[in-house]
């Protein structure tokens, strides 16, 4: 004799996060009387999705009309589908008692959900860093299923190989996340430039997600100095001038000493750009050689990013004999890097 | 989709009698058939449903008075030991109550219980 | 086990009018909602209006409506035609499967 049978067609159903899942489940009887209920797992822990006796499941509603008269459809639709629904639901047909007694379950139809991972976001040190330093770059994103996904890094659309990456839980879970460290060694080129992770997913249509940091906001590129002496612009006056070059980032401070002495602290302000992305400035210095009885030593002191400072002098010489009406100053450079 | 009952007559007390109601228009395996009668100048009363061998089941005053069989097309409710109180129209429905109500409805065969 | 009693035993109604009959259960029915309603013509078979306590079965008029849950359940005819006048039985279902209890009928008389 035929008994009734619990079918559920489907083994199993992916369904993208925020979408509606149908599950599917057709009995072959009308008999014995009493409801289908839907649970999420198995044994005595399981989840109860849906009962067509009683109670109220806002996210759940019957694809066919349950209260229709030979109804046998017993297929349901679960609204805005989150990873936290994944797993195996089942139908079963409970006989009408005090209590309802379960009768027969169906087979179960196991639901995966597919869960775009977030924007990965990338990190870089803490601390700027001078060229020829490897710096590590941190990239992360979060709540992905299922748990295959693709991590690529590049360095101005070349790719990187210095990486390591994890993806967690390494068991089943209802979503993942992902963590990767890379490895990038900077150069003076490198303030416009840019490090990217690029993460690739099923969820993604082949269109992957990309975070990025640039490398301005990561590299300290120190000011190379040089001190020159400009011919005289007026009588007794001699004009230095202190060549800041290839400097990133812009905040410097520059100090002039005079034989040791404080003469002028400024800040650069009317920087020039270069197409690297590193900045010039000059300062400059007029000296009244007059003044002076003795040789003046001149010190360009250059204070980049809160670094310890960089300096660099020039020594004007000052001729012994007395000076005539409108005849140069010797002067000869002997600058040196002093730091 | 059809239900009609037959085999009502005139029985003495205490002789069994066997009512078939004969279905078209469905399957058997996926519905129960059940039985109410109708006493004369009286209201309906469920008597049982027969669906599969492990769902037959009758009302408690039922039980033991009546039982049931089926095959492919037809359900049986056989009166064990009828008394003349017996006496109704019995009526043959598809469903078995709830979310299947009794519909439709056979015309009802006559059964008379005499001495 | 589960008793059904239905009131009023007999109504009459003029064409036009409204008619309803109240079904009492002595205990709530299986799932609030087992409860369905026959109108049965003299010589002729019950025929099914109502189940599961508001769902109009297929055919039937919308002027025949019901209403209730637990306990207390009501079938209205609205606008009662001359073909209304029959009996009208409730049919209450218990938690266990063989609990089904007709209630005593009503009897509309259609003026």
């Known amino acids: 004799e035929e008994e009734l049978q619990v079918i559920q067609p489907d083994k199993s159903v992916s369904v993208a996060a925020g979408e509606s899942a149908i599950l599917h489940c057709t009995v072959t009887s009308l008999i014995p009387v009493g409801p289908i209920q839907w649970f999420r797992g198995a044994g005595p822990a399981r989840e109860l999705i849906y009962n067509q006796k009683e109670g109220h499941f806002p996210r759940v509603t019957t694809v066919s009309e349950s209260t229709k008269r030979e109804n046998m459809d017993f297929s349901i639709s679960i609204s805005n589908i989150t990873p936290a629904d994944a797993g195996t639901y089942y139908c079963v047909k409970f006989r009408k008692g005090s209590p309802d007694t379960e009768f027969k379950s169906g087979a179960g139809t196991e639901l995966s959900v597919r869960a775009k991972p977030s924007a990965p976001v990338v990190s870089g040190p803490a601390a700027r860093a001078t060229p020829q330093h490897t710096v590590s770059f941190t990239c992360e994103s979060h709540g992905f299923s299922p748990r295959d996904i693709t991590l690529k890094w590049f360095k101005n659309g070349n790719e990187l190989s210095d990486f390591q990456t994890n993806v967690d839980p390494v068991g089943e879970s209802v979503s993942y996340s992902i963590h990767s460290t890379a490895k990038v060694v900077l150069t003076r080129e490198d303030v416009h430039s840019q490090v990217i992770c690029e993460v690739a997913h099923v969820t993604l249509q082949g269109d992957p997600l990309r975070g990025t940091a640039n490398l301005s906001e990561t590299i300290r590129v120190p000011p190379t100095l040089e001190v020159t002496q400009q011919p005289v612009r007026a009588e007794n006056q001699v004009n230095v001038t202190c060549q800041v070059r290839k400097f990133y980032p812009q905040r410097l401070q520059l100090t002039w000493l005079e034989n040791g002495n404080v003469s002028r602290t400024e800040t650069a302000s009317t920087v020039t750009e270069n197409k690297d992305g590193t900045y010039n400035w000059m300062s400059w210095l007029l000296v009244n050689v007059s003044a002076h009885r003795d040789d003046v030593k001149l010190t360009c002191q250059v204070e980049h990013d809160g670094q310890p400072a960089v300096s660099k002098s020039h020594d004007l010489k000052v001729s012994a004999h007395p000076k005539e009406q409108g005849s140069n100053t010797a002067a000869e450079n002997t600058g040196s890097n002093e730091r | 989709r059809s239900v009609e009952e037959s085999g009502g007559r005139l029985v003495t007390p205490g002789t069994p009698l066997t009512l078939t109601c004969t279905v078209s228009g469905f399957s058997l395996s996926s519905h129960g058939i059940s039985w109410v009668r109708q006493a004369p100048g009286k209201g309906l009363e469920y008597i049982g449903t027969?669906?599969?061998?492990?769902i037959t089941y009758f009302a408690s005053w039922a039980k033991g008075r009546f039982t049931g069989s089926k095959t492919s097309t037809t359900v049986d409710l056989k009166i064990t030991s009828p008394t003349t109180e017996d006496t109704a129209t019995y009526f043959c429905a598809r469903g078995s109550a709830w979310n299947d109500p009794f519909d439709p409805w056979g015309p009802g065969t006559l059964v008379t219980v005499s001495s | 086990a589960l008793v059904m009693t239905q009131t009023p035993a007999s109504v009459s109604a003029a064409v036009g009018g409204t008619v309803t009959t109240k079904c009492q259960a002595s205990q709530s029915v299986y799932g609030n909602n087992d409860l369905a309603w026959y109108q049965h013509k003299p010589g002729q078979p019950p025929k099914l209006l109502i189940y599961l306590a508001s769902t109009l079965a297929t055919g039937v008029p919308s002027r025949f409506s019901g209403s209730g849950s637990g306990t207390q359940f009501t079938l209205t005819i609205t606008g009662v035609q001359s073909d209304d006048a029959a009996t009208y039985y409730c049919?209450?279902?218990?938690?266990?499967?063989?609990?089904?209890?007709f209630g005593g009928g009503t009897e509309v008389v259609v003026k």
């Open positions: 049919l209450g279902g218990g938690d266990d499967e063989a609990d089904n209890v």
């Open positions: 027969i669906g599969t061998g492990v």
